[in-house]
Interface confidence: low
């Protein structure tokens, strides 16, 4: 900033603020003999003056909006007025001050928006201009909604992009706008310069009238369809309608069913195409889609719900061919023998599946019929008349009718009369001593065999023994399996042993029968046994808190941003060191101590998301054991890829001479993520000079048509530059070139004399 205040004649540039009365001289040029005086020419506008001695100054305020740069020339003259040096260019750049207010292009704007339009999607733009320099705050405009009328519950339904003036719906507006309640709104919009940040900014306002139009693209009410319909199919069940005619409708089956029994016609009527079976599938959810003529979705898909109504088309079924129960000889009247649970595939908790139970036959009828009764709705069998005697009748067979409101089914029950349970299980020893095991002993290992005996009738519920651990194993690390033939108990490891939490466990077993003991007999100390389990320490690897850690960040996060963290603990309490494995793209680093993961390079969703690396946790000291887990980094898209042509368009041609203006269609794409609606590109010619010969018109979000404006083209190749804007945040623009050849044609193909065969176009238009 410290420069020479005077010097020889040479090209120089100075910057001066506009609008301020002169307060400083600009420069003092020094003459080298034979030069004695100086002369100023160029865009002086009678403002810039050079004194004969070389003092350059200005005599009144500058105006950047009149001229932003003054290109001057200074020459040195000798005593005869002949130029002996120069002229050299002197550039005066006029720096902007905020001396112009922004102005809306219209004092009133009108627009319409459809209810339930996507929030944030612009439906109208307001536009203001400011003569000040747009590269400075003076010309940077900031749009704001001053008021929305009417304002319901203090909720804004509309929003404006502060920079672009794009008006769109808020989330609330998308959900709540309803033309039946309020068909029109008025917004007062302000624009300020200085980026809206200064008290000294200038402003302007405009009025926006907005009409809300009805959106008839709505999900219909859920449909109920009775199963096994005998009516002729297809049957119309509901309908959807796009807001304008001409939409192409289709259904999407998200569940990928082997049989999808629905269709839609081009009116938007939805049909069921065949009878449904509730027992196969009781509800369907699928989507109706509306597309334009180019197959692009017009809006979000609608969810269609179909519930299948039950009819009673299934009889009750028995749980097994024969259900076996046991009853002790001395059981009292009313005691429960067991419960018969039949099933019905019809809809639960309805009359179609509500079951009744009735005993229709008892064999033998000894000493009498009607020894048993069954609870009508619960299916529980009880002893009805007297205690049974095994020596008279060791077995009874019952036939039970199970019925719903339309169907009856017969089920068979066998009741075995068994000896009374008057003997308790007795352990062969009460203390099985100490057992020492390493904490890494395999799950499923048998670590101890225990044995109790029972003197009741063999192979009945009175003598069968079940072993339970009643003390010393609250974590459920151990279990006991019983051999049904020998009543031997095998103590097995069900969950990993752990020295750190349970080094010594005092285990107590209880031996029980599945059948109840007779009145007056109780389990005593003979039915209990104990043993002591001692667990020894094994150095174990660290344990991650999760098998897979997942994090989600935007692909444009700054280098050094924390993107996630992992945690592991060492069972022995040693410190842990974290490291990464498989970071093939070199995007990440991990804090060895905390497990925090940071970005160390630019991330790129288009290179692949999620990005998967392994995280390693290693003991510090000890045996340096380590464990591995996964870290998945989901990269959220930002708009960082400009549009481009979707394919190679070399070889486009028109037959010369053109008999009428022609056109061709091209497609654009980009590599960013597009939600259901796909890209929304806008197209324009890449330079103004092309506009006399060509025009470009948008067909839909991805396709455009390039048309000739006349027929007077030369027989040669033209390269047409197209500007494609993706309308993203921030908007990105690509300039692509379409080479179009005008050539003589033979039978619709380009004709080239021999020796001119290179680069022959192959597509005629």
């Amino acid at each position: 900033q410290e420069g020479k205040f005077s010097g020889p004649l040479k090209p120089m540039t100075f910057s001066i603020y506009e609008g301020q009365e002169p307060s400083q001289i600009i420069f003092q040029f020094k003459a080298n003999p034979p030069a004695v005086t100086f002369e100023l020419t160029g865009e002086t506008d009678n403002i810039f003056v050079i004194e004969r001695e070389g003092l350059l100054y200005y005599n009144r305020a500058l105006d950047r909006e009149t001229r932003s740069t003054h290109n001057l020339q200074v020459a040195a003259l000798d005593a005869n007025g002949i130029i002996v040096e120069g002229p050299v260019p002197i550039t005066i750049k006029v720096k902007d001050i905020n001396d112009n207010r922004p102005t809306f292009l219209q004092s009133k704007y009108e627009g319409s928006v459809r209810q339930n339009s996507r929030p944030g999607k612009p439906f109208l733009y307001v536009n203001a201009t400011d003569l000040d320099d747009p590269a400075t705050p003076n010309g940077q405009l900031y749009y704001q909604i001053v008021i929305q009328l009417p304002m319901i519950n203090n909720v804004m339904y509309f929003q404006i992009n502060n920079k672009t003036g794009a008006i769109s719906l808020t989330r609330e507006g998308s959900q709540e706008l309803n033309p039946a309640k309020n068909p029109s709104y008025n917004l007062v919009i302000s624009v300020k310069d200085m980026g809206g940040q200064s008290e000294n900014s200038f402003s302007d306002t405009t009025s926006v009238d907005i009409i809300v139009t009805e959106n008839i693209w709505k999900a219909p009410k859920p449909v109920e369809m009775v199963e096994n319909s005998t009516d002729p199919h297809p049957i119309k069940i509901t309908q959807v309608r796009w807001n304008d005619p001409g939409a192409q409708y289709s259904l999407v089956d998200k569940e990928k069913l082997p049989r999808f029994p629905f269709s839609i016609d081009q009116e938007g009527d939805i049909y069921v195409t065949q009878p449904l079976d509730r027992e196969e599938k009781d509800a369907y959810v699928f989507y109706a889609v509306a597309k334009d003529e180019y197959g692009k979705p017009l809006s979000y898909p609608l969810e269609i719900h179909v519930k299948v109504k039950d009819i009673n088309d299934n009889p009750p079924t028995c749980p097994s061919p024969v259900t076996v129960f046991e009853v002790q000889e001395n059981e009292r009247l009313g005691n429960s023998i067991g419960t018969l649970t039949a099933h019905d595939r019809d809809e639960e908790n309805t009359a179609n599946s509500f079951l009744n139970y009735r005993i229709v036959e008892q064999t033998p009828k000894l000493p009498m019929d009607g020894l048993f009764l069954i609870q009508t709705y619960a299916g529980m069998l009880q002893l009805a008349k007297q205690s049974l005697k095994k020596q008279d009748t060791p077995q009874y067979n019952l036939t039970i009718e199970v019925s719903d409101k339309d169907f009856k089914t017969l089920c068979f029950v066998q009741i075995n009369v068994i000896d009374i349970n008057d003997q308790i299980p007795i352990f062969e020893k009460s203390d099985y001593g100490n057992l020492t095991l390493a904490e890494d002993t395999n799950i499923g290992s048998t670590i101890l065999t225990i044995q109790a005996t029972d003197a009741d009738e063999p192979f009945t519920g009175s003598s069968k023994i079940l072993y339970h651990i009643i003390k010393g194993d609250s974590e459920g690390r151990l279990g006991v399996d019983t051999d049904p033939h020998t009543n031997t108990g095998y103590v097995i490891i069900k969950k990993p042993l752990d020295f750190e939490t349970a080094a010594v466990s005092n285990i107590v077993f209880k031996a029980e029968n599945p059948e109840p003991l007779v009145f007056g007999v109780k389990y005593n100390a003979s039915s209990f046994a104990k043993f002591t389990l001692i667990v020894t320490d094994v150095n174990e690897a660290p344990q991650f808190s999760q098998h897979v850690f997942q994090a989600k960040v935007s692909e444009d996060v700054a280098i050094g941003t924390k993107v996630g963290n992992v945690t592991a603990k060492d069972p022995e309490g040693l410190d842990i060191s974290y490291s990464l494995r498989g970071d093939t793209r070199g995007w990440l680093k991990i804090d060895h101590v905390t497990g925090e993961i940071f970005s160390v390079a630019p991330l790129d969703r288009e290179a692949g998301s999620p990005y998967r690396v392994q995280v390693v946790a290693t003991e510090v000291g000890g045996s340096s054991l380590s464990s591995v887990s996964e870290f998945h980094l989901i990269l959220m898209d930002v708009n960082d890829n400009p549009p481009r042509l979707a394919k190679d368009y070399t070889g486009l041609f028109f037959c010369h001479p053109l008999s009428a203006p022609g056109s061709l269609i091209f497609e654009a794409t980009d590599d960013d993520q597009h939600l259901f609606r796909g890209p929304h590109f806008t197209f324009s010619l890449g330079s103004g000079s092309l506009q006399n010969d060509w025009e470009v018109s948008k067909i839909n979000g991805t396709h455009a048509r390039l048309s000739t404006r006349h027929t007077e083209f030369e027989e040669r190749e033209y390269v047409v530059l197209i500007r494609i804007n993706d309308g993203g945040r921030p908007p990105l623009e690509g300039i692509v070139s379409l080479p179009v050849t005008f050539c003589s044609c033979v039978e619709g193909s380009c004709f080239r004399p021999a020796g001119h065969q290179t680069g022959i176009p192959t597509v005629g238009m």
Partner: nanobody, 118 residues
Framework: QVQLQESGGGLVQPGGSTRLSCVSS???????MGWFRQAPGKEREFVAL????????EYSDFVMGRFTVSRGNTQNSVNLQMNNLKPEDTGIYYC????????????WGQGTQVTVSS
């Protein structure tokens, strides 16, 4: 010999204010008066200046809105009112006579220390 004499400055609390003054031993036409500063370990940088007619003040971005440059009692004096001071404002403040739009320095003062610290 022409001299510039600065005064003011010293130790100031963050958020506080101080005023620097500078007097020249002679009056210059076409020459502007202003202030530069040098923080420890950094190059000398422009702070503010007042045009020789006193009708135009210029400021660097980092002091805009906090510092005000004004004419003293005479044509050959200039003041710098420093408000809302920050620790990064610490340094030696030099009065200077400059020439033209390029702010070419013709004459330096000997400097005065300003320390912003709690």
């Amino acid at each position: 010999q022409v001299q510039l004499q600065e005064s003011g400055g010293g130790l100031v609390q963050p958020g506080g204010s101080t005023r620097l003054s500078c007097v020249s031993s002679r009056t210059f036409s076409y020459y502007d008066m202003g202030w530069f500063r040098q923080a420890p370990g950094k190059e000398r940088e422009f702070v503010a200046l007042l045009s020789w007619r006193g009708n135009n003040a210029e400021y660097s971005d980092f002091v805009m809105g906090r510092f005000t440059v004004s004419r003293g009692n005479t044509q050959n004096s200039v003041n710098l009112q420093m408000n809302n001071l920050k620790p990064e404002d610490t340094g030696i403040y030099y009065c200077a006579v400059t020439y033209g739009v390029a702010r070419s320095v013709r004459l330096w003062g000997q400097g005065t220390q300003v320390t912003v610290s709690s």
